[in-house]
Interface confidence: medium
């Protein structure tokens, strides 16, 4: 009569799944904050820093009411993929000045990668539609100078911190709606 059936597959509790994602996001938020502070101490920022290749802000107070889990996770994953690419670029092309931020920048990259894999897993566990494979992004041009690399680092870490900050709030809110 064949082998006995295996134990019934327990469907994951979506709130618990989301909880662990929130914890990872909070942890990365704290790491980013510390690294941004370290960067400010070593290379004080004069004014604001922008990088056109960074994603535009996805969330604000007004957007919270209409949040839907699939949209948030898809957008968050896309934005964090972009930040991962920018962190990788910064480590490669940022110049010798930014080597003083190692190994912290490498740790940040690894944790960002881990959060992305966690988001991917969460989306499949919750049976959310998987986003299409990401089109190859155009390569980022190397900074024009050492100071250009430092300005880019301020923009990348500042943008990532803001994105993660809103992500924590959005994910906490979505958890209450599950």
């Amino acid at each position: 009569p064949g082998p006995p059936p295996g134990p019934p597959r327990v469907s994951p509790d979506p709130r618990a799944e989301l909880d662990s994602t929130v914890l990872l996001t909070r942890s990365l938020l704290a790491d980013t904050r510390q690294l941004a502070a370290q960067l400010r101490d070593k290379f004080p920022a004069d004014g604001d820093h922008n990088l056109d290749s960074l994603p535009t802000l996805a969330m604000s107070a007004g957007a919270l009411g209409a949040l839907q889990l699939p949209g948030v996770l898809t957008r968050l994953r896309a934005d964090l993929l972009s930040y991962l690419r920018h962190v990788q670029w910064l480590r490669r092309a940022g110049g010798s000045s930014l080597k003083t931020l190692e190994p912290e920048l490498g740790t940040l990259q690894a944790r960002l990668d881990r959060l992305l894999r966690r988001l991917q897993l969460l989306m499949s566990r919750l049976a959310l539609p998987q986003p299409p494979p990401d089109p190859p992004a155009p390569p980022l041009a190397p900074p024009s100078s050492a100071w250009g690399g430092i300005r880019a680092a301020h923009a990348i870490l500042g943008g990532l911190h803001l994105t993660l900050d809103w992500a924590v709030r959005g994910l906490l809110l979505l958890k209450t709606r599950l």
Epitope: R26, L29, A45, G47, D48, H49, N50, L57, S60, A61, G62, A63, G158, G159, H161, L162, D165, W166, V168, R169, L172, L173, T176
Partner: antibody, heavy 117, light 110 residues
Framework: EVQLLESGGGLVQPGGSLRLSCAAS????????MNWLRQAPGKGLEWVGV????????FYADFVKGRFTISRDNSKNTLYLQMNSLRAEDTAVYYC??????????WGQGTLVTVSS | QSVLTQPPSASGTPGQRVTISCSGS????????VNWYQQLPGTAPKLLIY???LLPSGVPDRFSGSKSGTSASLAISGLRSEDEADYYC???????????FGGGTKLTVL
């Protein structure tokens, strides 16, 4: 360095109007939601309202709805609070503050508004 | 009457550990992040704790936050005279669609 500098406070009669400004510098103003909060003399903190980074959404505390309006000019890095139909109980130090998520991470030094006849 | 409830005062001697409580409901603390602010005499408030227990850069790790259910607390260990200030808890309230604060706790270092 992030800086927020409020101005426009002063003495105004009950029923009168006043417009407060908050000049922002040291960060990309157009990326952040901005708030107004207030503190009556000797009292606690009170949230007045928030405007989203692109001005598309605004939320207000019940006690100011219909009387106060928050606006911003991202090209000038400035936040505004238009206060109409002022009452004695609106007397307070008014603060602008930046919101990156659920909290106020930077505050201005405040500007005093006194409503009295 | 504040939406969040804090004791009006707290005190301790230098080196001691003090805790300030903040209680709310499911529509604010229960469902949303709790933040704490410190207001030194005559100055603007300053962010002390965000997302329940995270410290902004520059805040010493003598300060810590925690949350359980609809209550939160702020702990200060190794109390110093410069910690004498007003402390406020805060959270978003889903019912009111806005930010609510506790009435504030005046901390005295004896």
């Amino acid at each position: 360095e992030v800086q927020l500098l409020e101005s426009g406070g002063g003495l105004v009669q009950p029923g009168g109007s006043l417009r407060l400004s908050c000049a922002a510098s040291g960060f990309t103003f157009s990326h952040y939601d901005m708030n107004w909060l207030r503190q009556a003399p000797g009292k606690g903190l009170e949230w007045v309202g928030v405007i989203s980074y692109d001005s598309s959404n605004k939320f207000y505390a019940d006690f100011v709805k219909g009387r106060f309006t928050i606006s911003r000019d991202n090209s000038k890095n400035t936040l505004y609070l238009q206060m109409n139909s002022l009452r004695a109980e609106d007397t307070a130090v008014y603060y602008c503050a930046r919101t990156p998520g659920s909290h106020f991470d930077y505050w201005g030094q405040g500007t005093l508004v006194t409503v009295s006849s | 009457q504040s939406v969040l409830t804090q004791p009006p005062s707290a005190s301790g001697t230098p080196g001691q550990r003090v805790t300030i409580s903040c209680s709310g409901s499911s529509s604010n603390i229960g469902n949303n992040a709790v933040n704490w602010y410190q207001q030194l005499p005559g100055t603007a408030p300053k962010l002390l704790i965000y997302y329940d227990d995270l410290l902004p850069s520059g805040v010493p790790d003598r300060f810590s936050g925690s949350k359980s259910g609809t209550s939160a607390s702020l702990a200060i260990s190794g109390l110093r005279s410069e910690d004498e200030a007003d402390y406020y808890c805060s959270a978003w309230d889903d019912s009111l669609n806005g930010v609510v604060f506790g009435g504030g706790t005046k901390l005295t270092v004896l």
